[in-house]
Interface confidence: low
């Protein structure tokens, strides 16, 4: 309605004598700003005067002056929006209706607010959920329709008069919609809280009691049970009787059914609060409890462990592990059902009692072959001794023992022989199934554990065999000790270190790489002629005539081996020089004459020089000196000189005679 002023505030506010009231309020005037505000207590409209009568609690005028007695009541609003009020302290006679008389330039309005002030602080109100179940978290709410900035309060929770240790969350509201103080407590009630009193206590800022509200908790829970047994320790012997009684200590709502369980399984036809077990057997040993149900669900008692004692039953032996490997550890376990547990054990190996073995377990840290056999045991407790069971078999497995490689051949073995070896062993479990040989070769194994080496090599030094079952055991290697003729025979020059010159001292060595047997003889030969029988061949002063092809031989009792032919080369200066003439030493003028410088040299002559009868060198440097046409003046004695890398040599004089031709004689 556009002709109305619009207000928002709580409809009724609650307080008590001496407290205060805070009235949240907003408004919207029809036109313009607020010019006048009067707060009436229980205002009544006077038709005669066309004004409101009543107690004026607060009055503001255009000049803004407020009488001093009005300080108890405060207008906290403004001229266009806020109309919030505070009364502090508030008194019992403030109860009733508050009238807010608002005037703008052209419009007027009276807004009414109810105020309820009690003589004493009024109690808060506890709100509970419709149903509370044990162990399910619930929220308890305590609500008080009061809040004021000038009067702080607190709400505290008590259980059976004792402050609750759970943390409560307190919230306040001072809005135009609502004014309240609320405390919320999250709480997981147990069955033992059923019927207990919960209090929400209103206190002032100093903790002084103002008022409270109380409720009684109705906690729904499954039946709570106690079980009693005779005898109290629940330990009996076969044939004894046992009585168990189930007592309900609490149930909400009332219980409806009762049953008994053994090891979690329901016992048939047992629906009373007493369970009688007559002449019990060992099979009745176990965990017993009673179960009682109501609408919430089933409740169970604690378990009673009924132990029916009996003498040990026939025992069995468990072996960890069989078959066992020699050297490994083995554990034997004697298994016998008995109550109480056996206190003593007797162990047997192949029917013979094992001394000093009285424990449930027998541990052998290092198994040996003789440990194999049948193991059995007897268990004993306070009620008697059990029977010996069938026992268990221990199989001890081990690698082949004392493996040896045996040479079957007569000794010594020679290179090229056929050698037979066998692989022998002392014992084995499991049986030997194969053999291995080292080193590997293209050899025959004509039968299991036998090796045949055809055409044995000189370098076949050692052979080892292994006998194998699940493992292989290697024998120590045996030496074949193959005998052979000397190998890799060669001639080696010891001195001189450089090339051999005529006149040098020369030593040749006859080398070989190996020989078995080691005792050897040496032979040197040149062109099929025996030169010596030592490992070295020596020349004090070598001559060109010593050059040639040399071989050495080395022999032992198996055979002899020759080196490759080795060429001995002697270097020497040109020697035995002479000048030969062609066609002869007498030549007719006009013909041709060729002089040749012949020599013996190593390396060959590299340079020739020619000389005449005056020892005058001629401008010719080849081996042949050609005169064409020859003249009478060429007659005379000639000689030559040859040079190589070693040195020089010269020839004796050779005379050439050139005679006149018939024509020349005829002209004279």
């Amino acid at each position: 309605d556009s002709s109305k002023w619009v207000f928002e505030h709580p409809e009724t506010l609650y307080a008590w004598e001496g407290a205060c009231v805070w009235i949240p309020c907003t408004y919207r005037a029809l036109d313009g700003d607020l010019e006048s505000f009067i707060l009436f207590h229980n205002p009544e409209y006077n038709k005669n005067t066309s004004k409101f009568d009543g107690t004026r609690l607060y009055e503001s005028t255009k000049d803004g002056k407020v009488p001093s007695e009005q300080k108890r009541v405060q207008f906290l609003g403004d001229k266009n929006k806020n109309c919030t009020l505070s009364i502090h302290p508030v008194h019992l006679n403030d109860s009733g209706q508050l009238g807010l008389r608002m005037e703008s330039k052209t419009e007027k309005w009276m807004e009414r607010i109810h105020l309820n002030v009690s003589e004493r602080p009024f109690p808060p109100h506890i709100q509970l959920p419709p149903e509370i179940q044990e162990s399910q978290e619930v929220t308890l709410t305590c609500l008080l329709n009061f809040s004021c900035y000038g009067y702080p309060i607190q709400l505290q929770w008590l259980l059976e008069g004792v402050p609750m240790r759970q943390a409560a969350v307190t919230s306040t509201s001072l809005t135009i919609k609502s004014v309240f103080t609320r405390s919320e407590l999250k709480f997981s009630p147990q069955w033992s809280h059923h019927g207990k009193i919960v209090t929400c206590q209103l206190q002032d800022a100093d903790g002084k009691f103002l008022s409270n509200d109380t409720v009684q908790l109705n906690v729904k829970h499954t039946p709570k049970l106690e079980i009693k047994v005779t005898p109290s320790d629940a330990i009996v012997r076969e044939g004894d009787s046992v009585t168990m009684t189930c007592e309900v200590s609490s149930s909400n709502p009332e219980y409806t059914t009762v049953s008994w369980l053994k090891d979690g399984t329901s016992l048939k036809k047992q629906n009373t609060f007493t369970l009688n077990l007559r002449e019990v057997t060992k099979d009745q040993s176990g965990k017993y409890c009673c179960q009682v149900s109501n609408d919430v669900g089933p409740g169970r008692s604690e378990e009673v462990f009924l132990q029916v004692q009996y003498a040990p039953e026939p025992s069995t032996v468990q072996i960890l592990h069989s078959p066992a490997v020699e050297g490994s550890q083995v554990e034997f376990l004697c298994m016998s059902l008995a109550n109480p547990l056996p206190t003593n054990y007797t162990w047997y190996h192949n029917g013979k009692e094992m001394q000093g073995r009285t424990e449930e377990k027998v541990h052998i840290p290092k198994i040996l072959p003789w440990h194999a056999g049948t193991y059995s045991c007897v268990a004993e407790n306070i009620l008697g001794t059990g029977q010996r069971g069938p026992g268990a078999e221990l199989d001890v497995q081990y690698p082949p023992k004392k493996v040896t490689t045996v040479i079957q051949n007569p000794m010594p073995i020679r290179e090229g022989d056929t050698v037979t070896l066998s692989c022998n062993y002392n014992s084995s479990n499991p049986s030997v199934t194969r053999y291995e040989w080292k080193p590997h070769g293209a050899w025959e194994e004509p039968s299991l554990g036998v090796l045949k080496i055809q055409n044995v090599g000189w370098d076949n030094t050692t052979i080892a065999c292994a006998a194998c079952n699940s493992w292989c055991s290697w024998a120590s290697p045996v030496a074949l000790n193959v005998q052979y003729a000397p190998r890799d025979v060669r001639v080696r020059k010891i001195k001189p270190l450089s090339e051999i010159h005529s006149g040098n001292s020369v030593s040749l060595q006859c080398d070989f790489s190996s020989s078995h047997p080691k005792e050897v003889q040496f032979f040197w030969e040149k062109n099929g002629r025996l030169l010596g029988k030592e490992s070295q061949l020596n020349f004090d002063s070598i001559s060109p005539e010593d050059a040639g092809s040399y071989s050495c031989w080395v022999n032992n009792s198996i055979g002899q081996t020759a080196s490759k032919a080795w060429t001995l080369e002697v270097l020497y200066a040109p020697r035995r020089l002479r000048v030969s003439m062609s066609p002869g030493d007498q030549v007719m003028e006009g013909k041709s004459a060729t002089l040749t410088c012949e020599s013996d040299a190593n390396p060959p002559v590299s340079h020739y020089t020619w000389f005449d009868w005056n020892n005058q060198s001629l401008p010719y440097h080849s081996q042949k000196l050609r005169l064409e046409p020859v003249k009478v003046q060429h007659s005379g004695a000639y000689w030559c000189q040859g040079t190589n890398s070693v040195g020089k040599g010269r020839s004796p004089l050779s005379t050439l005679t050139v005679y006149y031709s018939p024509e020349t004689i005829g002209r004279r």
């Epitope: 490997v325 292994a466 194998c468 699940s470 493992w471």
Partner: nanobody, 127 residues
């Protein structure tokens, strides 16, 4: 003289590492499978790890799997045990041993098949 000599033991904090060496003299190690064993005070000797003569097959006790590594250097005639993430329960005297038998990697070295044993080296794991 034929002998095996262990070295590399000592005091180490939990979580630490050690490298044990087993050096052979007087014989060629590459003909032999090598096992590491240990014996704690008052306890039985137990197999720790095993390596074949070629180094191609290895085996470890469950208690050391993923922490210990066995290796060998045949050229140096030496076998090693690298021990990481050590625990107080690894405290023991560690022995190496050499033996010759068919080894397929699926078992521990059987102590009964060992031809040569070392004198041991003490490993103490303590904070």
């Amino acid at each position: 003289a034929v002998q095996l000599v262990e070295s590399g033991g000592g005091l180490v904090q939990p979580g630490g590492s050690l490298r044990l060496s087993c050096a052979a003299s007087g014989f060629t190690l590459d003909h032999y499978h090598i096992g590491w064993f240990r014996q704690a005070p008052g306890k039985e000797r137990e197999g720790v790890s095993c390596i074949s003569n070629s180094g191609g097959s290895t085996n470890y006790a469950d208690s050391v799997k993923g922490r210990f590594t066995i290796s060998r250097d045949n050229a140096k005639n030496t076998v090693y045990l690298q021990m990481n993430s050590l625990k107080p329960e690894d405290t023991a005297v560690y022995y190496c041993a050499a033996g010759r038998w068919y080894y397929d990697g699926s078992r521990y070295c059987p102590p009964g098949a060992m031809d040569y044993w070392g004198k041991g080296t003490l490993v103490t794991v303590s904070s």
